[in-house]
């Protein structure tokens, strides 16, 4: 079906709407497939949760979002942002970036097209 | 080698219509986004429309959608604007321009612009 | 009026070096790439930048490009008199909907 695309609605809306949502469970997850499984991760006591459940949580996470879709770019540098500090070189910063990039798909939503991720000013 | 080339412009009366179309040679049309960029005389760029791949998706500019169609036919990789309703201030020179955007992560950017065809609206 | 701000004229001798600037909201710098052209007088513009550092095959090292925020540099060493243009930076705006365009920036080499 061919379909004209009006306007997006406003991004403030989206940041309100990514402010309400948890996005520990991203982070978490995320922070588990780029450091394995079987090795602590010191922010956060994953221990106990398997990365497919964390997966799960922050697909719903995401899900919460009335317009998951058109506010899943700013989710993703708000995830980006957050973890930012945490990412301890290079490496790290790109692997974390590729695993965010997943992370749509994952949860069965189409990646956001562009959607600039080095948000942090250099920083990342 | 990429090429484009414009053709249609011309003057027009206001309220009239034109059909600018743009021939593209040299990569795989049916691959690309695609764009047309006008400028108006000593003014700077100003975008104008977007139409994805396969022409499911098109963006407009505020002041020319519902006046201004912007369509592709990928077997003859050629690109249209038909535009009607047209006002003095859609005068300009107008670019069709290939648009890098990809699927996912990436920007719009504009790789290779036509030689440009100037569109004039006046009485 | 743009909605992405930049400088009306920047000048510098030739072998400096010169920033020109792009200013624009969250909702367009701030959340999508940045790309840069130049626009030599009575002539198509170019692509110079894209996804706001990388750079087109053909274009010389001498063009860079970077962005913090809502804010897009493009910078220009070593400056010939060739260089002397008009550059534009363009962004996507997620609000509109549309691409948009600074107001252009004409260099002048000294």
């Known amino acids: 079906m061919r379909r004209e695309r009006g306007r997006q609605g406003d991004s403030s809306s989206c940041e309100r709407q990514v402010d309400r949502v948890n996005l520990k469970p991203c982070e978490q997850h995320i922070m588990q497939r780029i450091m394995g499984e079987q090795e602590q991760y010191d922010s956060y006591d994953i221990r106990s949760t398997r990365s497919s459940d964390q997966q799960q949580r922050c697909c719903d996470e995401l899900n919460e979002m009335e317009n998951t879709q058109r506010c899943m770019c700013e989710a993703l540098q708000q995830i980006m942002e957050n973890q930012c500090d945490r990412l301890q070189d290079r490496q790290m910063v790109q692997q974390f970036k590729r695993e965010l990039m997943n992370l749509p798909q994952q949860c069965n939503f189409r990646a956001p097209q562009r959607c600039d991720l080095d948000v942090s000013g250099g920083r990342c | 080698e990429v090429q484009l080339v414009e053709s249609g412009g011309g003057l027009v009366q206001p309220g009239g219509s034109l059909r600018l179309s743009c021939a593209a040679s040299g990569f795989k049309f049916s691959t690309f986004y695609m764009t047309w960029i006008r400028q108006a005389p000593g003014k700077g760029l100003e975008w104008v429309a977007n139409i994805k791949q396969d022409g499911s998706e098109k963006d407009y500019l505020d002041s020319v959608r519902g006046r201004f169609t912007i369509s592709r036919d990928n077997a003859k990789s050629s690109l249209y604007l038909q535009m009607n309703s047209l006002r003095a201030e859609d005068t300009a020179v107008y670019y069709c321009t290939r648009n890098g955007l990809q699927d996912s992560y990436s920007g719009d950017f504009f790789d290779h612009w036509g030689q440009g065809t100037l569109v004039t609206v006046s009485s | 009026q743009s909605v992405l701000t930049q400088p009306p004229s920047v000048s510098a001798a030739p072998g400096q070096k010169v920033t020109i600037s792009c200013s624009g909201t969250g909702s367009n710098i701030g959340h999508n790439y940045v790309s840069w052209y130049q626009q030599l007088p009575g002539t198509a513009p170019k692509l110079l930048i894209y996804d706001n550092t990388k750079r087109p095959s053909g274009i010389p090292d001498r063009f860079s490009g970077s962005k913090s925020g809502t804010s897009a540099t493009l910078g220009i060493t070593g400056l010939q008199t060739g260089d002397e243009a008009d550059y534009y930076c363009?962004?996507?705006?997620?609000?509109?909907?549309?691409?948009?365009f600074g107001g252009g920036t004409k260099l002048t080499v000294l």
């Open positions: 363009a962004t996507w705006d997620a609000d509109l909907s549309a691409v948009l």
